[in-house]
Structure formats: C-alpha cells, structure tokens
Interface confidence: medium
C-alpha cells in the first residue's frame, strides 16, 4: 500500500498512546543524555504534526519520510554538538546516510547510573501521574538499551504499570514492589540481550544470517507448522527486527502487529501452544507468541536420512536451489532437536553444506556423503562436556566461586580487555550455573549454549568500540555461530606484558562497608581481575589466600568503630601482603 | 489437509500419448513437492516423475526419462503428466501424490508422501 503520508499511516495504524511510547523511545534511545522533560517537548511536537497529517495528508511536509521528521527534530536541537559531540555531525548529511550516521552513534555503555527503585518515592510519582510514570520507565530503559525491541518495551511498561496499581495500596510497599521490580528487571534485561544480538546478527553478519538463526528457533518451538509457514514467518520477523534495530520504530511496531495477527489467523497450521496467547490484547498477545511453549513433535516423522543422505537426488537438490535445501534441512533438523542451542543446529548445517559443497563436486557423491550424519556427533559432545564440566563446577563452587573461576579463565585469556567488561561478562558467564544447571538434561544445552551466546555478544559489542584484543576481534566476527567454541577454545595469553603493580587500584574506603552484596562482591571482583593483570601467572593458591585475606580485611574494618580510619591504617598493611604473597 | 483428484487416464495404442492431470484442493499446489507414482498389476508402487515445492526442479525414473513430462500451472492448482511414446510396460495405476510444507525434496520413497489420489488407470494395448 502507498500512503501519501507515512507519519499519518502510522498513526492512524497504532492510535495515539503506542504511537507516543514509541516515538519517545526513538528519541530516548538516539539521545541518551537528554533530559526526559526535553524528550516529551519533543514527543509532543511530533504527535501534533502527526494529528495535523491525519486531518489532511497533503499539508506541508506530512510527505516526508519519517527517518526525514525525526532526523529533522534531533537536528534543530539547540545544544546538540554542547551534549553530543560528533553526534551533531551527522546533522550535515543527507538521507539515508544521516540516519546511519545517527545509529553509528547510539551507546551500548552509557555512562548513566543504575536505577536504584524506591518504593514510597516510586508511588508518590505513580499516583500523581501515571501517563509520566510510564513515559519516565520508557525513557529510562530505552536510554540505557538503545537497542531494546520498542513494541516490547511497551508490554513491559504495561506490566511495570501494573505492579504498581497492585503495590501501591499495599501496606508494605517495599515488599511487594521490590522482589516483583527485582524479577521484572531480570526480564528487561534478558530481553535488551536477546534483541541487541538479534540486531548484531543483521548489521554483522546479514539478513541470511538472522534468518537461518529464526528458521533453527522456530522450527523447534512449532515442529507441527510445514516448512513453508515457517518460511513466510521467518520472512516477515526478519523484516520486524531489521525495521526495529534501524530505528524505524513505528513501522517496526506496525508490522510485529499484523506479524501476531496472521500467526493468530493460521494458528491451526502452526501450533496447539497459541490458543491462550491469541485471545489476549495486542502487546500481550506478540509477547506471548514469543515466549510461547514448544509445540509436541509430529508424531509421525520420518527418518532424516531418507532426504538427506539415502536420496540419490541430494546434490541435484543442492545445487539447483541451494538456499531452499539447506533451509529445508535446517527446518527438519531443527523441528526433531528441540534439546539442541540454535547455535549448534546452525553449526551442524554448516557442516551439511560443507560436507554437500565438497561431496558433490565428486566422482561418487552418495559414497562421499554417505556418512554426513556421524560429522555432527562431535560437534553436539563438545558443548554437553563443557556443560557438564562447568556445572559440576557452579555445584562445588556456588555462584560466587563460580564466577570468580570465570574472571580468572577469561582474564587469562584475554587480559588486555578493560577491568569493567571483564567483572560485568564473567559474572553473567557466572549466571549461566543457576539458570541452567538445575534444569533437566535435556534443556541445559539449548539453555546454556543460548545464554552464553547473549553474554558473549555483550563482550563482542563492548568491545568493538574500542578494540585491544585481536583474539576477542577474531572470536566475534569470524563466525556468528561459532563465537562461543572460539571463547571456550582461547587458552591464556602468553604474549601478555603484565600491568605494573598500582597501590590505587587496591585502596578500599568505608563506602565498601554499607553497600549491596552484589556491588561489594564487584568490587572483590574487580580487584581479583587487576590481580591477575598484574600477576597472569598466579596460582589458584595463591589467588584464593588473596580474597581470603581481602575478606578478612574488610570484615574487621567494618566492623571496627571508625570505618574509615582502619581501612586508612590496614590498607597499606593488606597491599604489602598482597605482594608477600604474590612475590 | 490436501485432496487429490485424478483424471486422463484410458486405453492408449503402444506409442501414442496421453495427458493425465491432478487437480489439488486444500493447499497451493506451488507449495507443494507433488510426485507421480504407478503401480501394475500384482505389483509395488514405482516412482515415476517429481516437481519440488516452490522451486521448479524435476525428476524422473529412469523407465520414463525423454517420454514423459511432469509440470504443474498454479493458476489451476493442478500437476501433468504428459506420456509420449508410451509402451505396454507402462500400462498401471497412476496416482498423484503430495508432500506438503514445500520440501524441496521429491522424494522416490512412496511412504513419505502423506497424501494421495485414487488414481486413474492408464492401459497401453494395441
């Protein structure tokens, strides 16, 4: 369909209050500095220019594009180049470029503080103005994700409402908001990991390479669905998430509707899982598509190999389509191994096409390919031992210890990455024990090898902008799907120069004393990794006699009346151990 | 669910021609790997010609190679098989049958093929 005015389209297509959510997204997550008063001014702008193009689709610059309204909007802004630096450069290209200009900018590590929530302040704002509170949850996400999937933002600024319509009245607002808020950022969190990889496939590595990652997913949670359903939603996710991570939110929101809506419409074709999902309004409806349960397998399926291997036409399907037979072999894999990470199907696919590329330009094909299947045995053993291995290890070590065995095997293999990525990766590494290991068998693959890839994706984005390791730029962008067996493979760097030993990284203040857990076992965390930038060599022995003596030293000066003077007088005392020790 | 519905089948003189058609209801036959199969008298099910689903690719049996032609118009939902040159040893039941969901793969095997016709007789004699 062609519209005269898009913006008009738009919001004719998402009414007012998804169209203004995604809009103050958009600009939330293009200026992350902004003020949010700042991005309501210019929220409200766009809206009423919006409403003046649905009254009538020919006035003045309603035939705009809306890459070209928006990128007008961020430019007219008076202290762009003060707050955004080079940000204000882009301003002086053209459509299209300046609008990957402006993507090229957005920040995966923002330098803005974590949101502590308190709940008597949180409630105050919630009853004053509840239209602010959702716009304020947005605006704070979205600034820190600038890659969170928009039309998912908004379903869990539903949910974040809600929890504080049931809270608010409660008579312990505190306990009923925080684990409810704690178990709600989890999920925010996961999600911002799971679209910034989705969006990470598509910009490095193509749309082939997000699609084939889709088909492997979708093929396992509706086995029941025929490869050509499963082709058409794969087709048109691929067009949601590449609209989503361009910035083109509302097109982006607009096509994941009638995305839900078609899935709905089919739903006896694609799975007995979407009954409950379908009757649900909007929002609720495409997430709960997305998290939806695994359909059972059809019970009548055939052996692989009938098509695979003992086909005496496999290199005449191969090489006259090729896409459409490797498709079709990663759908009929997939649907029959929902056990397996989608990383690993796409491995095994490789090897198919490999084995296909090479057997099929031979003398005897069938001879050659005969034995394709029994290539995959050790592809899908290496992931289950490392598994096995690692949670044998989160078991005996808790998470704690855990994590601090990531920071050292990490630091060791790659120690010129900054301190902070290595304690933020190697603890969510860490995480990867509690979430997956006392799942059942077979779900731990799928569920570990899943998670890591999420992680490792972080490191891989962090990293890129500001690149000090060839091992870590090689690891995550020679191959999408190899990117955890490249990690698990890298051994410690021997070529590593060793920091000088600097006091200041080890002088602890009384502020150690009152913080959270978590932030205390952070800054453990980051003393170990410049332990081991110093001392790479350093035994087991010798590391855990070091937190031994740290967690000794903090506990007495913490409990000492005059926080501040101990850790003034023991401090110097611990550093000077820490170096017997080490010597 | 698909249907198949053959038709054209009838006595032929050794090396005349016939055209047999397979009208499909209940899904795209584009979307479709469709094949014919034969059986004769006292006989298995043969494979006698293949077209992928969603990509034109064919396959013949090695009895029928240069005689016989499989093609399918989507406009009509409909599979051929155009016979030439057709000898007494082609005198069987011709059925249409499909495997739905767009595998590329014509498969030679008749049990991977869920759904089926119920044929039409095609008699060579002079």
């Known amino acids: 369909d062609t519209y005269k005015s898009e913006i008009a389209h738009r919001f004719k297509d998402l009414g007012e209050q998804y169209f203004k959510g995604l809009v103050l997204i958009a600009f939330s997550q293009h200026l992350q500095q902004c003020p949010y008063e700042e991005h309501v001014k210019l929220v409200r702008e766009v809206t009423e220019f919006a409403k003046t193009c649905v009254a009538d689709e020919s006035a003045e610059n309603c035939d705009k594009s809306i890459h070209t309204l928006f990128g007008d909007k961020l430019c007219a802004i008076p202290s762009l180049r003060e707050h955004y630096g080079d940000l204000a450069d882009c301003c002086e290209k053209e459509e299209p470029e300046r609008n990957e200009c402006f993507l090229q900018h957005k920040n995966d590590n923002p330098d803005i503080p974590k949101l502590k929530p308190d709940p008597v302040a949180l409630c105050a704002d919630f009853q004053e103005d509840e239209q602010k509170f959702w716009g304020k949850y947005l605006y704070e996400i979205a600034r820190r994700h600038p890659y969170f999937y928009a039309p998912e933002l908004l379903y869990y600024a539903i949910i974040y409402k809600d929890v504080f319509s049931e809270c608010c009245q409660a008579a312990d607002k505190a306990a009923c908001l925080l684990p409810k808020i704690e178990h709600l950022r989890e999920k925010v969190l996961t999600s911002a990991a799971k679209q910034r990889l989705k969006c990470a496939s598509i910009q490095k590595f193509g749309e082939r390479a997000f699609k084939a990652w889709s088909l492997a997913r979708l093929s396992q949670r509706f086995p029941k669905a025929d490869f050509t359903e499963i082709s058409k939603i794969v087709t048109d996710l691929a067009k949601v998430h590449k609209e989503c991570c361009h910035g083109d939110l509302l097109e982006c929101a607009d096509d994941r509707a009638d995305l839900a809506k078609y899935i709905c419409e089919n739903q006896d074709t694609i799975s007995t899982k979407l009954k409950e999902c379908c009757d649900k309004p909007l929002l609720e409806k495409s997430h709960c598509i997305a998290e939806a349960k695994r359909d059972e397998l059809p019970a009548d399926l055939n052996p692989l190999e009938h098509d695979f291997v003992e086909d005496k036409e496999v290199c005449k399907n191969y090489k006259e389509a090729k896409h459409v037979f490797l498709g079709t072999f990663l759908y009929e894999y997939s649907r029959r191994h929902p056990d397996y990470s989608v990383s690993l199907l796409l491995r095994i696919a490789k090897i198919y096409e490999a084995t296909l590329e090479d057997c099929c330009a031979k003398e005897d094909p069938p001879a050659c390919y005969a034995t394709v299947f029994d290539k995959f045995q050790p592809l899908v053993d290496e992931p289950k031992n490392l598994i096995k291995q690692n949670c044998e290890l989160f078991e005996k070590l808790g998470e704690y210890g855990f994590q601090n065995a990531l920071i050292v095997r990490y630091t060791k293999k790659v120690p010129q990455v900054s301190t902070p990525t290595l304690v933020e990766v190697a603890r969510k590494l860490g995480l990867v024990g509690s979430r997956c290991c006392k799942r059942p068998e077979e779900e731990r693959l799928s569920c570990a090898e899943d998670y890591l890839s999420l992680v490792l994706n972080r490191l891989c984005v962090l990293h890129e902008k500001t690149p000090v390791s060839e091992k870590v730029t090689k690891c995550c962008t020679e191959s999408l799907v190899n990117r955890r067996p490249c990690f698990s493979a890298l051994t410690p760097d021997e070529t590593y120069k060793p920091k000088e030993f600097v006091e200041g990284t080890f002088t602890f203040h009384a502020d150690l004393c009152t913080l959270p857990e978590d932030e205390k076992q952070i800054k453990k965390q980051t003393a170990l990794v410049e332990l081991l930038k110093h001392k790479p060599h350093a035994t087991e022995e010798q590391l855990r006699t070091v937190l031994g003596n740290f967690a000794a030293f903090v506990q007495k000066c913490c409990a000492a009346p005059d926080h501040e003077a101990c850790f003034a007088v023991e401090g110097p005392k611990f550093v000077i151990e820490i170096r017997g020790i080490l010597a | 669910e698909v249907q198949l519905l053959e038709s054209g089948g009838g006595l032929v003189q050794p090396g005349g021609s016939l055209r047999l058609s397979c009208a499909a209801s209940g899904r795209y036959i584009d979307e479709t790997a469709v094949a014919w199969f034969r059986q004769a008298p006292g006989k298995g099910r043969e494979f006698v010609a293949g077209?992928?689903?969603?990509?034109?690719?064919?396959y013949y049996a090695d009895s029928v190679k240069g005689r016989f032609t499989i093609s399918r118009d989507n406009s009509k939902n409909t599979l051929y098989l155009q016979m030439n040159s057709l000898r007494p040893e082609d005198t069987a039941v011709y059925y249409c049958a499909a495997r739905p969901g767009r595998p590329l793969i014509t498969s030679k095997v008749a049990d991977l093929y869920p759904y089926w016709g119920q044929g039409t007789l095609v008699t060579v004699s002079s």
């Open positions: 077209i992928g689903g969603g990509v034109d690719i064919t």
